[in-house]
């Protein structure tokens, strides 16, 4: 599987799951999330050869023929498989609230 | 809706459905397919500008932080959102067989 | 180009305050982490705290909690460093550092250092 | 806290050679890690970010590899110039501690 445990491990030029931090204020402007101060959002990067981690008929056939075709330029692309919810503290006035932001952490990827 | 509908009809530089024919002997090299000959795969490309179409709470962070830092490499990718089967007649021997492989046609796309 | 450039040498009593200051220039400065970083003569690199100053959030370590105060002002670009109830071993080189784009806390332009020296 | 420890604190090399310094965080720190370079009286410079991405301007000798808990920092080629104290730093979490450095000579 393309995710952390095998990504961040390796020097992987295709497809995978890469580490990418991301700071709140600095990075988005969001200057209303008070904690955490960031997070590893992660993304994902990388040539997509045919059959690699392949997420549809489409992306197989997509797969082979930008293969055949080298030249071409359609091929699969490599974009988020599982994502996970981040918890984030935030402060409405003095009230404080928790809230769980879904599909914020990319665990791992396909070629789509 | 990032569909047929709207981008094989307008110059759209950003995400969007392309049209691409594939021809099963030329483009595959299979020969096995009897019916149709080829079929209107296509496929999807353009940038992703913060919040075009975006997949995901993720792909929204992503679109932004790309945005402000520019110079950075992780950004969301125009993937396939609604794929269609498509009918194909192929033979075993002499014996005729129609089939409906899924997920084979591209009808929209989305920023992932 | 991006500086960053910190006020002169102290001496101060022990029991005293220090303010240090850290001057900012060629970026937007109330859109990057300053941090703050101590180095005792001869001796390791020592993470104190850090400032947003878009909004004035800080961060600091434990060990200097209570004793240290970073604040800063968009209207000059600058970064300050409190340290209160100075002591023999606050003697030391003060560094303000800026976080860079693109990464965790890594710090990609340094001040030139403040030297801070604690006798009696 | 996090703890970083840095090994060796000091080594004498011949120039031209290989230089490796590690470093071992108490706990995982995923790819977190910075390395600096420090000369005599001047101050600290950032060399590797995300453990092994070289920054701007940065000569191509030194590099930088790791992931989770074990570090190691590269001089391929060691040069006159290099001579310095590196430092790595996680940047995993606060507080964003340091190596406690390892001193680069010249043999």
């Known amino acids: 599987a393309l995710d952390t445990n095998y990504c961040f491990r390796n020097l992987e030029e295709n497809c995978c799951v890469r580490p990418l931090y991301i700071d709140f204020r600095q990075d988005l402007g969001w200057k209303w999330v008070h904690e955490p101060k960031g997070y590893y959002a992660n993304f994902c990067s990388g040539p997509c050869p045919y059959l690699r981690s392949a997420d549809t008929t489409h992306s197989t056939v997509l797969g082979l023929y930008n293969t055949l075709n080298p030249e071409a330029s359609a091929s699969p692309c490599c974009v988020p498989q599982d994502l996970e919810p981040l918890t984030i503290l935030y402060y409405v006035g003095r009230t404080p609230k928790v809230e769980q932001l879904s599909n914020m952490v990319v665990k791992s990827c396909k070629c789509s | 809706a990032l569909d047929t509908n709207y981008c094989f009809r307008n110059l759209e530089e950003n995400c969007c459905v392309r049209p691409l024919y594939i021809d099963f002997r030329q483009d595959l090299g299979w020969k096995w397919v009897h019916e149709p000959k080829g079929y209107y795969a296509n496929f999807c490309s353009g940038p992703c500008p913060y919040l075009r179409s975006a997949d995901t709470t993720h792909s929204t962070v992503l679109g932004l932080y790309n945005t402000l830092n520019p110079e950075a490499s992780a950004s969301p990718c125009c993937v396939p959102q609604d794929l269609e089967p498509l009918t194909i007649l192929y033979y075993v021997g002499r014996t005729p067989k129609v089939e409906q492989l899924s997920n084979m046609v591209v009808k929209s796309c989305k920023c992932s | 180009q991006v500086q960053l450039v910190q006020s002169g040498a102290e001496v101060k009593k022990p029991g005293s305050s220090v303010k240090v200051s850290c001057k900012a220039s060629?970026?937007?400065?109330?859109?990057?982490?300053i941090h703050w970083v101590k180095q005792r003569p001869g001796k390791g690199l020592e993470w104190i705290g850090r400032?947003?100053?878009?909004?004035?959030?800080?961060d600091y370590s434990e060990k200097f909690q209570g004793r240290v105060t970073i604040t800063a002002d968009k209207s000059t670009s600058t970064a300050y460093m409190e340290l209160s109830s100075l002591r023999s071993e606050d003697t030391a080189v003060y560094y303000c550092a800026r976080r860079m784009i693109t990464t965790q806390a890594a710090l990609d332009y340094w001040g030139q250092g403040t030297l801070v020296t604690v006798s009696s | 806290d996090i703890q970083m420890t840095q090994s060796p604190s000091s080594l004498s090399a011949s120039v031209g050679d290989r230089v490796t310094i590690t470093c071992k965080a108490s706990?995982?720190?995923?790819?977190?890690v910075a390395w600096y370079q420090q000369k005599p009286g001047q101050s600290p410079k950032l060399l590797i970010y995300y453990a092994s991405n070289r920054y701007t301007g940065v000569p191509d000798r030194f590099s930088g590899s790791g992931y989770g808990t074990d570090f190691t920092f590269t001089i391929s080629s060691l040069q006159a110039e290099d001579v310095a104290v590196y430092y790595c730093?996680?940047?995993?979490?606060?507080?964003?501690?340091f190596g406690g450095g390892t001193k680069v000579e010249i043999k």
């Open positions: 400032i947003y100053p878009g909004d004035g959030d800080t």
């Open positions: 060629g970026y937007t400065f109330s859109s990057s982490w």
């Open positions: 730093q996680q940047d995993y979490s606060s507080p964003y501690t």
């Open positions: 706990q995982s720190v995923i790819n977190a």
